[in-house]
């Protein structure tokens, strides 16, 4: 014959565990249900009554099977550097992030505590490290041979085209100039950018090696903070 | 005890450089952040710009992002702020100010510590 | 940016009677962790600043319990029960809920 299945509330087993999405109450000292994400407890069990469960109200959540009295209460609203990426729901919290163009300069257990904005590499530097959710852009001078005429937190340094005949070389923050209507080829057809990021977890871009035309004397800037007069901005 | 100790009076001509230290002792430098503020003469506090001196992110005040470069030496507690091209309004007394960090997870106080101040006067 | 804006900007008082600071900011102070980072600093003649009042309403150590903050969201006061001779100063409140942090103006404080 089967085991008979036990229906809540019920006497453990001396030594015995409650089952799963079950806790013991000391009080009753039964076994009885949880209640399931998105509500609490209204009423806790007695030896003769399970959990009574209630839905959370508007703006509290639950996010595990739970024996709360009480749902606990979402976050406030997003400051006005952060983003909503995820609503407030009877069975989650909301979750602020850095808006687009922004990074977490601060961040803390409950979440980010400061936003800043993503450094911008000005004309003649470009990225060497493109931002992530938690650390700011690195610029770079741009190598002989390479050129960046923008000023962009996603922009890399491009070589210059190749030209048959140069009207005006071209320099760290222009590109070459051709007296032909065409040059033989052009390396760079457009602004190259960086993608942002969406998660920085196991996210550990290398600055990846620019082509250049003529020998590389590129350096990266400090870890730290760049000096904006060297290849960056504000806003 | 917890303090924040800057470097002396600087004197400077207008296009000239000033790097001032704040020197940090008494906390774990790296759990918290530093806020530089200045005061010109008979005016109020102007917010100068911020560094986590765990990971070395800054934020620099829009006005001065590009003439000032704020930094940290972890194994001296030290920050630093270096502020270019001086000119006769930058003659301010310059503050540290420490902050919260990554690493202080008690209550939130704010701009708890002071330094002393540093004169900066700039003039030809 | 947040604007800080303070009121009165002077504020003679007479030793021993109360004093009250208004401080408002152009937008809400409430940060997404729920905290509101609004302080109160005291700068005396010739010294640097000083916190008394952090995230409101908590006064930091070692400052007298004459000194009580209130308010939420845009809105928020400080008070003096009942001012001493030492309370001369300059008051300032500022916010530190997103970057970049800004001051208020300041309200001086001295005895009629």
């Known amino acids: 014959l089967p085991a008979q299945v036990a229906f809540t509330p019920y006497a453990p087993e001396p030594g015995s565990t409650c089952r799963l999405r079950e806790y013991y109450d000391q009080t009753a000292q039964m076994c009885c249900s949880k209640c399931s994400p998105g509500q609490h407890a209204k009423v806790f069990c007695t030896k003769t009554s399970d959990t009574v469960c209630d839905s959370c109200e508007d703006s509290t959540y639950t996010q595990l099977w739970n024996w709360v009295p009480e749902c606990l209460s979402c976050g406030s609203r997003c400051s006005s550097d952060q983003v909503e990426t995820q609503a407030c729901t009877r069975e989650q919290n909301r979750i602020c992030t850095c808006r687009p163009g922004w990074y977490c300069a601060l961040s803390k257990q409950e979440g980010c505590r400061l936003c800043a904005p993503l450094r911008k590499c000005r004309p003649g530097f470009g990225v060497a490290r493109p931002g992530t959710e938690t650390s700011d852009v690195v610029c770079k001078p741009c190598a002989p041979g390479t050129f960046s005429n923008t000023t962009s937190s996603t922009d890399i340094c491009r070589p210059h085209q190749i030209c048959n005949v140069v009207a005006i070389p071209g320099n760290a923050s222009m590109d070459a100039v051709c007296t032909s209507t065409s040059p033989t080829r052009s390396m760079a057809p457009g602004a190259v950018h960086l993608p942002q990021p969406v998660s920085t977890r196991s996210q550990h871009t290398q600055p990846t090696p620019e082509p250049s035309t003529a020998p590389s004397t590129s350096f990266l800037l400090p870890m730290g903070p760049s000096p904006p007069a060297e290849g960056s901005t504000g806003d | 005890q917890v303090q924040l100790v800057q470097s002396g009076a600087e004197v400077r001509k207008p296009g000239a450089s000033v790097k001032v230290s704040c020197k940090a002792s008494?906390?774990?430098?790296?759990?918290?952040?530093v806020t530089w503020v200045r005061q010109a003469p008979g005016q109020g506090l102007e917010w100068m710009g911020w560094?986590?001196?765990?990971?070395?992110?800054?934020h620099y005040a829009q006005n001065l992002q590009d003439r000032v470069t704020m930094t940290t030496d972890t194994s001296t507690s030290t920050a630093y702020m270096e502020l270019r091209s001086l000119r006769s309004d930058d003659t301010a007394v310059y503050y540290c100010?420490?902050?919260?960090?990554?690493?202080?997870?008690?209550?939130?106080?704010?701009?708890?510590?002071w330094g002393q101040g540093t004169t900066v006067t700039v003039s030809s | 940016d947040i604007v800080m804006t303070q009121t009165p900007l002077s504020s003679p008082v007479t030793l021993g009677q109360p004093a009250s600071i208004s401080c408002r900011s152009s937008?809400?102070?409430?940060?997404?962790?729920?905290?509101?980072?609004l302080s109160w600093l005291q700068q005396r003649p010739g010294q640097p600043p000083r916190l008394l009042i952090y995230?409101?309403?908590n006064r930091f150590s070692g400052v007298p319990d004459r000194f009580s903050g209130s308010g939420a969201g845009t809105d928020f006061t400080l008070k003096i029960s009942r001012v001493e001779a030492e309370d001369v100063g300059v008051y300032y409140c500022?916010?530190?809920?997103?970057?970049?942090?800004?001051f208020g103006p300041g309200t001086k404080v001295d005895i009629k």
């Open positions: 100010a420490r902050e919260e960090g990554s690493g202080s997870y008690e209550d939130y106080y704010g701009m708890d510590v």
């Open positions: 008494g906390y774990t430098f790296t759990s918290y952040s």
């Open positions: 560094i986590n001196a765990f990971s070395g992110n800054t």
């Open positions: 937008q809400s102070l409430v940060h997404s962790d729920g905290n509101t980072y």
């Open positions: 995230k409101i309403s």
């Open positions: 500022m916010q530190t809920t997103q970057f970049p942090f800004t």
